[in-house]
């Protein structure tokens, strides 16, 4: 904002008010200029001279029209779990927000004072409510017929695949494994051979990557392409 055009202080009319961007100085009993954002009052007004404004020094700021004697100090540098989303300037304070994977556990007027890592739901549990800038993830146990085999702050419980014949029933932390009922196409060396299941995930699931497996575990996966599922997942 440009600095206000200078003018001589004046006494407001009885019952009148000062203009916008002015204040009534009780000592001088005059309407006097405020200083614009980025400046502060170096010298207060008198009956014959207006407010003298001066620029804020480095690492200080004023965000509003004001008549403060000193500019405000910018907040300290952002911590390692934060990102600086607004730099400290003469007209605005530094703003720190939480980096991805974190949420604000203790906010301040602008930005965040304390960040915390988003909760990860362990296998057998899925995300019931995703994390936001200011709230943690809420986990829930996977309902019968669904599973989650990951430790994740984003993965939801997904339906078990449906088999003609089940080799290993699914549980809350593992998908169902289907029995081989016909020859399969060869796969990469060391890969498990498995026929295409009767159907892929039921239609109300979201497309999700193949579940990751724990070391030393060899989950059986369907062979060949499977169409992405549509729609959104229910609880």
């Amino acid at each position: 904002l440009p600095a206000q055009v200078a003018f001589t202080p004046y006494a407001p009319e009885p019952g009148g008010t000062c203009r916008l961007r002015e204040y009534y100085d009780q000592t001088a009993q005059m309407c006097c200029s405020k200083c614009p954002p980025g400046q502060h009052a170096k010298v207060f007004c008198t009956k014959t001279s207006d407010t003298v404004c001066d620029s804020c020094e480095d690492s200080t700021y004023t965000q509003l029209w004001n008549w403060v004697p000193e500019c405000l100090s910018c907040g300290s540098r952002c911590s390692s779990d934060q990102v600086e989303t607004q730099a400290c300037t003469r007209e605005q304070n530094r703003i720190c927000t939480c980096r991805p994977g974190w949420y604000c556990a203790l906010s301040k007027q602008e930005g965040c004072r304390l960040c915390a890592q988003l909760r990860k739901c362990r296998p057998g549990f899925g995300v019931a409510r995703p994390g936001t800038e200011t709230s943690d993830v809420v986990c829930k146990p996977c309902a019968p017929g669904t599973f989650s085999n990951t430790t994740s702050s984003t993965d939801i419980c997904r339906p078990h695949q449906i088999c003609h014949v089940v080799a290993i029933p699914g549980n809350a932390s593992m998908d169902a494994v289907c029995t081989s009922t016909s020859p399969t196409r060869s796969m990469a060396p060391g890969a498990v051979h498995l026929p295409q299941p009767v159907s892929t995930r039921s239609q109300h699931t979201q497309p999700t990557p193949a579940p990751s497996t724990a070391p030393g575990t060899s989950f059986l996966l369907p062979v060949g392409p499977s169409p992405p599922a549509e729609g959104s997942t229910g609880d």
Partner: antibody
């Protein structure tokens, strides 16, 4: 681009209240005064008052004290004017207008909200 | 409060004609805080001239403003059809800000 988007037309009964809104975009909402003006059909412009969203400071003309209440929501960059105890003479178009921050000129105007008071 | 009186209230001008309208203040006003607005039917007013003589963005150069103290004027050097509108003067030398009653400019 600076824009002031005002709420839609209002039809109210005498004695009722209405709340008009003005959503600002394209500039730092907290750094500029927002003013409200009244224009009756075929007539001139009348200044109601103003609010500084940065600290909530308000100014009113004597005539509109008790009639108009100005507020601002920094989080949504929206200014509000509530008009109470409506009477037929309150039927008018109301404008929100930004102060230019330098010469006290009104540099950006909302499209206006028409208020009709009728029984 | 400062009262602004505009004259004439209504005027008509032929295309190409020079047009002048005036704004008289009840007490002296700083030229920095005297402005003009243009309003067309069904539209919001637009800042047209600020601080007595400065044209707002997009205003054609055929417009000019002048004055000091209690007497101000807006002039159009050569009237064009799009200039038909109502023009308001406005002061904020002292609170509250006030407007003139407007000059309605029509095409003859």
């Amino acid at each position: 681009e600076v824009q002031l988007q005002q709420s839609g037309a209002e039809l109210a009964r005498p004695g009722a209240s209405v709340m008009l809104s003005c959503k600002a975009s394209g500039y730092t909402f907290t750094s500029y005064w927002m003013q409200w003006l009244k224009q009756r059909p075929g007539q001139g412009l009348e200044w109601i008052g103003a609010i500084y969203p940065g600290d909530g400071d308000t100014r009113y003309t004597q005539k509109f004290k008790g009639k108009a209440t100005l507020t601002a929501d920094k989080s949504s960059s929206t200014a509000y004017m509530q008009l109470s105890s409506l009477a037929s003479e309150d039927s008018a178009v109301y404008y929100c207008v930004r102060d230019d921050g330098l010469y006290y000129a009104m540099d950006y105007w909302g499209q206006g909200t028409s208020v009709t008071v009728s029984s | 409060q400062i009262v602004l009186t505009q004259s004439p209230t209504i005027m008509s001008a032929s295309l190409g004609e020079r047009v002048t309208m005036t704004c008289t203040a009840s007490s002296s006003v700083s030229s920095s805080y005297l402005h003009w607005y243009q309003q067309k039917p069904g539209s919001s007013p637009k800042l047209w001239i600020y601080s007595t003589s400065n044209l707002a963005s997009g205003v054609p150069a055929r417009f000019s403003g002048s004055g000091s103290g209690t007497s101000y004027s807006l002039t159009i050097s050569s009237m064009e059809a799009e200039d038909a509108a109502t023009y308001y003067c406005h002061q904020y030398h002292r609170s509250p800000p006030t407007f003139g009653g407007g000059t309605k400019l029509e095409i003859k």
